[in-house]
Interface confidence: low
């Protein structure tokens, strides 16, 4: 007869006995692990689809020690997932204007390598300007041409137009560079081109390493303007001095992609739009675009958080002479987190961090055993996830409880019904030199062949001190062991079921009385260890009144210490 409960205990090899502890697959776009939510911060507004900032989850980055929880080199070495900006339906609060479409520029600007995160490029007075202040890797959705040594950018389209491509990850062998794709705009760019490569239709590859200052003016034809951002942070500024045909307004797109495992946070630094202009923000990278905000909600100081690693901002302006409004947004990547793990019923969970690398450790109340992994780790992914299923605390069918000081044993399924055809054995063992008191919290057995036996000893042959077959009423004063063991047997037959049993135990020293217990009440004691001579006074919680037994009891009889009266019970008024 094996009395050991089938659980992982200390001293046993972890990762071997655990059940249901297998890795779960990272959530996929087709089968998201849970609903995607996003969050905004001040000013506090009741916004459609907006949740208040969850301080515990999202402010952890401010706490000491959190840096160590970030994945090493969070923006290297893998490139962000390819953009697929076309089509992007269902923008929030859209009128009849066309939805996002894939930009098809006549020409792309030269990639540049910024000098620092702070924005190294200075506007040039002679040309219209878009300020880009982020250190960015190339977004894979645009093929980027590179000038050969000594070449000057043409003011007319080259014979081969550079159009959006979806050919997989960009060339991450080069440093991060900005991609600027514009149509109907002149853009001045100053910076360093470093080891950039581009391949054309004829498989010719050009590589240059040179420093240039250039002004690129593209053909003035109606159409969208579009920019890709792929660094950990950057600024999004409204296009300024963009010359357009008189009958066409601007339709500009800003695509942001950060490293998987991070979300995009966009802060409104300044915004001043003209009537009729729109700015819309969506989260991308999930199964569907996620509307985040539109101009109605984009107030100065507002923070929009996309829970995905890609976001898109669309700006639609009025045609001249009204001219476009202006805005200045700042975006940055923020570390996404695992969801807070469910606290198991009849147990507890301790979380060190919800960010990747953080852990959750689970414990069960006495009488329950953990099924599953005791320790989960938050893994980095596009949507971070726990490396195992959340465990549950189950009432075990038997087990050995050594060093039993105080606690309880419950039947499997408690407080729900037990199963049929059970045979459960529990062995309770008090610390050396102590005895046990067993208190009946609840016993509810089906009126057939289900049976509870409690034996005064450590095995199935020990003499019974309680047998549900023999006794109609529970001994309200409980049971005392003569030695340090109780052996509890619960057996159920093939029919009928009930709640089963919950037994509370406590150990007490020789020469002492056991610790009293009263449900829905309290007691005060003249001494903490209950030697002979101790008096205990009981009281009930509000709404309950004392019944049966005595309000004050005393530990008597030095030879066989025991309470002189039964513990009272507190009943609801």
């Amino acid at each position: 007869l094996s009395l050991e409960a089938p659980t992982v205990g200390k001293g046993q090899a972890p990762g071997i006995e655990e059940t249901d502890g297998e890795l779960t697959a990272a959530p996929t776009p087709e089968q998201p692990e849970r609903g995607v939510h996003f969050v905004t911060t001040a000013p506090t507004l009741k916004l459609l689809n907006h949740h208040p900032l969850l301080e515990e989850f999202l402010q952890e980055g401010l706490e000491k020690g959190d840096e160590e929880l970030r994945p090493a080199l969070p923006f290297q070495p893998d490139p962000p997932a390819p953009f697929t900006p076309s089509p992007l339906p269902r923008l929030a609060n859209q009128d009849s204007r066309p939805v996002f479409t894939s930009p098809t520029p006549a020409m792309a600007a030269v990639p540049t390598q910024p000098q620092s995160k702070e924005g190294p490029w200075s506007p040039e007075s002679e040309s219209p300007m878009l300020r880009i202040t982020a250190p960015l890797p190339p977004g894979p959705s645009m093929a980027v041409p590179t000038l050969g040594p000594g070449e000057i950018a043409s003011t007319t389209p080259p014979s081969r137009a550079w159009t959006p491509t979806q050919e997989g990850p960009g060339d991450m062998g080069r440093p991060w560079v900005a991609e600027v794709v514009s149509q109907g705009a002149g853009i001045g760019i100053q910076g360093t081109i470093t080891s950039s490569t581009a391949s054309g239709d004829d498989e010719e590859t050009t590589t240059t390493t040179t420093i240039i200052t250039t002004t690129i003016t593209t053909v003035q034809t109606p159409g969208p303007c579009s920019w890709n951002f792929s660094g950990p942070e950057g600024s999004l500024d409204s296009p300024t001095d963009l010359s357009s045909p008189t009958d066409v307004g601007l339709d500009c797109f800003f695509y942001i992609s950060v490293y998987p495992g991070y979300g995009v946070e966009i802060k409104v630094q300044n915004i001043s739009l003209r009537e009729g202009e729109t700015v819309t923000v969506e989260g991308l990278g999930g199964p569907d675009p996620l509307p985040l905000a539109n101009q109605s909600f984009l107030l100065r100081g507002q923070v929009i958080r996309s829970p995905t690693h890609q976001a898109a901002l669309r700006f639609q302006s009025l045609p001249p002479p009204a001219g476009p409004g202006t805005f200045h947004f700042h975006y940055q990547a923020y570390l996404l987190s695992c969801h807070f793990p469910r606290r198991p019923a009849y147990g507890d969970v301790t979380v060190t961090s919800l960010h990747p690398g953080g852990s959750a450790r689970f414990h069960c109340a006495t009488g329950y055993q953990l099924k599953g992994a005791r320790h989960l780790t938050c893994l980095n992914a596009t949507q971070p996830f726990w490396d195992s299923k959340e465990p549950v605390c189950i009432a075990a069918c038997g087990g050995v409880i050594r060093n039993a000081t105080t606690g309880r044993i419950v039947s499997p399924g408690f407080p729900g019904n037990y199963s049929n055809n059970l045979t459960c054995h529990w062995l309770l063992e008090a610390p050396e030199g102590q005895r046990l008191h067993l208190h009946f919290e609840k016993v509810s057995l089906a009126e057939d062949d289900d049976r509870l036996i409690i034996r005064n000893g450590d095995n199935v042959e020990a003499p019974p001190v309680y047998d549900s077959y023999e006794v109609e009423y529970l001994p309200i004063e409980g049971l005392l062991s003569s030695g340090k063991h109780f052996f509890v047997e619960l057996s159920t037959d093939s029919s009928g079921a009930a709640a089963g049993m919950a037994l509370r135990y406590e150990a007490f020293q020789q020469g002492h009385c056991y610790e009293p217990f009263v449900k829905y009440g309290n007691f005060s004691s003249s001494t903490p260890t209950y030697p002979v001579g101790t008096t205990v006074e009981f009281s009930c919680d509000p709404g309950y009144t004392l019944e049966q037994g005595s309000i004050i009891i005393e530990c008597v009889d030095p030879h066989d210490p025991q309470w002189n009266e039964t513990e009272p019970a507190c009943r609801a008024v």
Epitope: G11, P14, E68, P71, D348, P356, G357, S359, H375, T377
Partner: antibody, heavy 114, light 106 residues
Framework: QVQLQQPGSVLVRPGDSVKLSCKAS????????MHWVKQSPGQGLEWIGE????????NYNEKFKGKATLTVDTSSSTAYVDLSSLTSEDSAVYYC???????WGQGTTLTVSS | ENVLTQSPAIMSASPGEKVTMTCSAS?????MYWYQQKSSTSPKLWIY???KLTSGVPGRFSGSGSGNSYSLTISNMEAEDVATYYC?????????FGSGTKLEIK
Amino acid sequence: QVQLQQPGSVLVRPGDSVKLSCKASGYTFTSYWMHWVKQSPGQGLEWIGEIHPHSGSTNYNEKFKGKATLTVDTSSSTAYVDLSSLTSEDSAVYYCVGGHYDYWGQGTTLTVSS
Amino acid sequence: ENVLTQSPAIMSASPGEKVTMTCSASSSVNYMYWYQQKSSTSPKLWIYDTSKLTSGVPGRFSGSGSGNSYSLTISNMEAEDVATYYCFQGSGYPLTFGSGTKLEIK
């Protein structure tokens, strides 16, 4: 059964660096944090930091940042601590601790002496 | 940093005597761990989750406490219990150990 094997002792000169190893067996190496603990002669125990082999995530005791670097090689189920710019203050026994704080290596005695 | 203060630093007990050592945490912890270390050997996890004994630990040992205050008790001291006992918390970073209680036999 669970075993964490560490070299018995290492002697290095001041200013040098050293990489101590800890080879794990008998449990799922990638499922549990691996901790490193320092015990100076006649002193108590100090937690250096932890690394999770599956994700490579690390947490360090502020006191050991810049001194210790934790790495793992999952293919060989081995954890490492790299100690740099060694001084006599770094002479100690270094333990690796696996599982849920359960399993300790026998410790590596590091002596820094010229 | 959560500082764990153990007391007493050194204590001696006679065989059969009851021994109690305490560990006080500067910040509340969820669970306390206790290690036993004998001279020239690695520490061994002795008690985990405040009161659970590691497999093979004699029943005369017990652990209790909550919040900021925890204790390890030996109901009747035996010669083999001579060792240094360290408390340890894993509830917050950095993880910390107590300075240890050295238990000797009279």
